[in-house]
């Protein structure tokens, strides 16, 4: 907290410029008008203020906007955003995707901080759902974003937004998350033809039920082993040897290398040895 002191004669700031870097903390407090700061926030980032000086500028904005900053100020916070606490951010009402992008840019290259997580949460809740443009933006900055959401949060993702999801965005999703996302993807891609559909749905198959896997096995999709290994164990177990052979196509030989791993291990144990022998891979049930 900076003490209230009178501004020395001739030091009253008329605009936000580089001369302010020579001001002591108490001088910034006394000589910079908060309303001026708010209207010229876009200049702050071009000036090499110290962390201590930024603290003073934040304090001035906090005093001017005790109920939370307006979006016109938020959009131009720049590096001052790093000074904000989650509690500060919870007071904001961010509606513009451009504002969101501007603040995410400040944190670019770093892991998602509590501040960023709170900002995103406020933004998405304000919009009511995770639309395609928002998802595009968030996954561009944080490829793991989608998988950081709870199944409950994912349920608000409309199927149309699924088009924005890239395979790498799903790398860290767990089964419960894929259970929510798979039906949305199935709906989003339903009008595509066989081979194109499989390319799009492949990353989501960790949430697919047995009947969908059986259907895919009839379409010559040649699923790779990496995808097969991510399928739900309970979805794989009812598949027959013939169905797995059709599903994997030429990749069926890869089962041998994965015979000690789930879900392959569980599936092998549930097959008749005679059926396994037809694969010619030496798999033992």
């Amino acid at each position: 907290e900076v003490e209230k002191t009178a501004c020395p004669s001739g030091k009253k700031a008329r605009e936000i410029d580089e001369s302010l870097i020579f001001y002591k903390k108490w001088e910034l407090e006394a000589c910079v008008d908060a309303a001026l700061l708010a209207t010229q926030m876009d200049r702050v980032n071009a000036i090499p203020f110290t962390y201590e000086q930024l603290d003073v500028l934040k304090h001035k904005l906090d005093e001017l906007y005790p109920q939370g900053y307006p979006e016109s100020v938020i959009q131009h916070l720049g590096y001052l955003f790093l000074k904000m606490s989650p509690e500060d951010i919870r007071k904001w009402n961010v509606t513009s995707l451009e504002t969101l992008k501007a603040l995410l840019e400040v944190n670019k290259g770093h892991e998602m901080s509590p501040q960023v997580a709170t900002l995103i949460d406020r933004f998405v809740k304000g919009r009511g759902q995770l639309d395609k443009d928002t998802l595009d933006t968030l996954t561009a900055f944080y490829p793991g974003y989608l998988c950081s959401l709870s199944p409950e949060e994912l349920s608000s993702v409309p199927p149309s937004s699924i088009w924005a999801v890239r395979p790498q965005d799903l790398d860290t999703c767990d089964p419960r998350q894929l259970d929510v996302l798979y039906p949305k993807a199935r709906l989003a891609f339903q009008n595509m033809n066989g081979s194109e559909y499989f390319v799009k749905i492949q990353s989501f198959l960790g949430g697919a039920p047995t009947e969908d896997l059986k259907a895919l096995s009839q379409q010559n999709v040649s699923m790779d082993l990496a995808t097969f290994m991510k399928l739900r164990t309970d979805a794989v177990l009812p598949l027959t040897v013939a169905e797995v052979q059709k599903l994997l196509g030429p990749h069926v030989e890869g089962l041998k290398a994965e015979e000690r791993h789930r879900p392959v291990r569980d599936w092998i144990l549930r097959q008749r040895q005679d059926d396994l022998d037809t694969l010619g891979l030496g798999l033992q049930g």
Partner: antibody
Framework: QVQLQESGPGLVKPSETLSLTCTVS??????????WSWIRQPPGKGLEWIGY???????NYNPSLKSRVTISVDTSKNQFSLKLSSVTAADTAVYYC???????????WGQGTMVTVSS | DIQMTQSPSSLSASVGDRVTITCRAS??????LNWYQQKPGKAPKLLIY???SLQSGVPSRFSGSGSGTDFTLTISSLQPEDFATYYC?????????FGGGTKVEIK
Amino acid sequence: QVQLQESGPGLVKPSETLSLTCTVSGGSVSSGSYYWSWIRQPPGKGLEWIGYIYYSGSTNYNPSLKSRVTISVDTSKNQFSLKLSSVTAADTAVYYCAREGKNGAFDIWGQGTMVTVSS
Amino acid sequence: DIQMTQSPSSLSASVGDRVTITCRASQSISSYLNWYQQKPGKAPKLLIYAASSLQSGVPSRFSGSGSGTDFTLTISSLQPEDFATYYCQQSYDASYTFGGGTKVEIK
């Protein structure tokens, strides 16, 4: 509900064979949905998986114990058993039997039985 | 064998604290990761299976997350009955392995 109960001698001499039985009540070892495992815990230490058996008789053992372990199932008695040969003091532990469900986790455990290897 | 490394090995916390325990696998185990709680003289109790699914009857203050090699068990608000030792376990590879355990003690 399903319950597991370990039984067997609490004291075994070095170089002899440790034999334990797990009796399943309220469920069947013949169910194709489960694996039946043995797990042990030396005093003051962590958990070590020993091996499992499937109702069909298929077994899978911890590689570090494989040469000394045999797990068998008796569906008529609704039991599965553990035999560990050539025991030493290092085999002194609480031995648990456990059921592994479809989710790949040990969802039901016996209360454990302490086995001491000493002459 | 797949090695499971838990951290920390022990921690002191107070009732109401948020507690996080991590488990790292030496290679990818997909989501085949389970968490158990064990109290002295008792058998372990399953808390979380398949990385994030809460076992029936387990309080919702327990949650799990992660996939691949890095996993987390979180207790959102520690209760007196939660002071115990926690173990992670992988069931992806046929040779199951447990983490070394994390003892949660009263501060």
